[in-house]
């Protein structure tokens, strides 16, 4: 029986060109985490295997860094990075737990634009 719960960073936003940390945390279970998959909508971003360590998908290796912990750091964000991200915890003996994060990548902040065109 699955007793654990996944906590995530939920709905988050970040600026274009910046970076963001995606974090999930599995609690309330003594199940052993054997692997964590990070998926972006419909493609695999990275895998953290308890025995083999991290594997970053080749198409993302320039922009994705492992960690902190079982989380994932996305760098050089573009508006195309907007969307759903899933952390999938493979555990024994519980099975899989899934968490969802929605990332919105924004153009430079209004505050920055405002400062740039401020009337002296």
């Amino acid at each position: 029986m699955m007793t654990g719960t996944i906590e995530t960073t939920g709905n988050i936003s970040a600026e274009k060109g910046g970076s963001i940390i995606l974090q999930c945390h599995l609690s309330s279970t003594t199940a052993q985490v054997t692997q964590v998959n990070w998926e972006q909508q419909d493609q695999l971003l990275a895998i953290c295997n308890a025995d083999l360590g991290w594997h970053i998908s080749p198409s993302f290796k320039d922009r994705v860094a492992p960690g902190p912990g079982l989380g994932l750091t996305l760098q050089s964000l573009t508006v195309n990075d907007t969307g759903e991200y899933f952390c999938i915890y493979h555990t024994y003996p519980d099975g899989t737990y899934t968490g969802r994060i929605f990332l919105e990548v924004l153009e430079s902040s209004v505050a920055e634009h405002g400062a740039r065109f401020q009337i002296p």
């Epitope: 998926e39 909508q41 419909d42 493609q43 907007t82 969307g83 929605f102």
Partner: nanobody, 116 residues
Framework: EVQLVESGGGLVQPGGSLRLSCAAS????????MGWFRQAPGKEREWVAS????????YYADSVKGRFTISADNSKNTAYLQMNSLKPEDTAVYYC?????????WGQGTLVTVSS
């Protein structure tokens, strides 16, 4: 203009089943992901399931995994949520949305009540 129309809700006994439909228009269905969300009385809206056409990947919240199945028919621009083994805690208004959009276009939702 994006339009999403949910249907199929109703009153069902615990352990029963329902199939929700979401008819979508105003965007290219096959290039998108679609998601189902729900909002129970006095609670925040929560994600239930998502499907992506390009890969066929499906994702489920742990609370519905093994009981709910998300699917889609591209030719009809319609997404579905098959809900089995319903529990009282599944009672909520169910909404569909284009999962890729930062600002979701919500439909009116469809009410699912699970009660004996």
């Amino acid at each position: 203009e994006v339009q999403l129309v949910e249907s199929g809700g109703g009153l069902v006994q615990p352990g029963g089943s329902l199939r929700l439909s979401c008819a979508a228009s105003g965007f290219t269905f096959s290039n998108s992901g679609m998601g189902w969300f729900r909002q129970a009385p006095g609670k925040e809206r929560e994600w239930v399931a998502s499907i992506y056409w390009s890969s066929g990947n499906t994702y489920y919240a742990d609370s519905v995994k093994g009981r709910f199945t998300i699917s889609a028919d591209n030719s009809k621009n319609t997404a579905y949520l098959q809900m089995n083994s319903l529990k009282p805690e599944d009672t909520a208004v169910y909404y569909c949305a284009n999962s890729n959009k930062p600002k979701f276009d919500w439909g009116q939702g469809t009410l699912v009540t699970v009660s004996s």
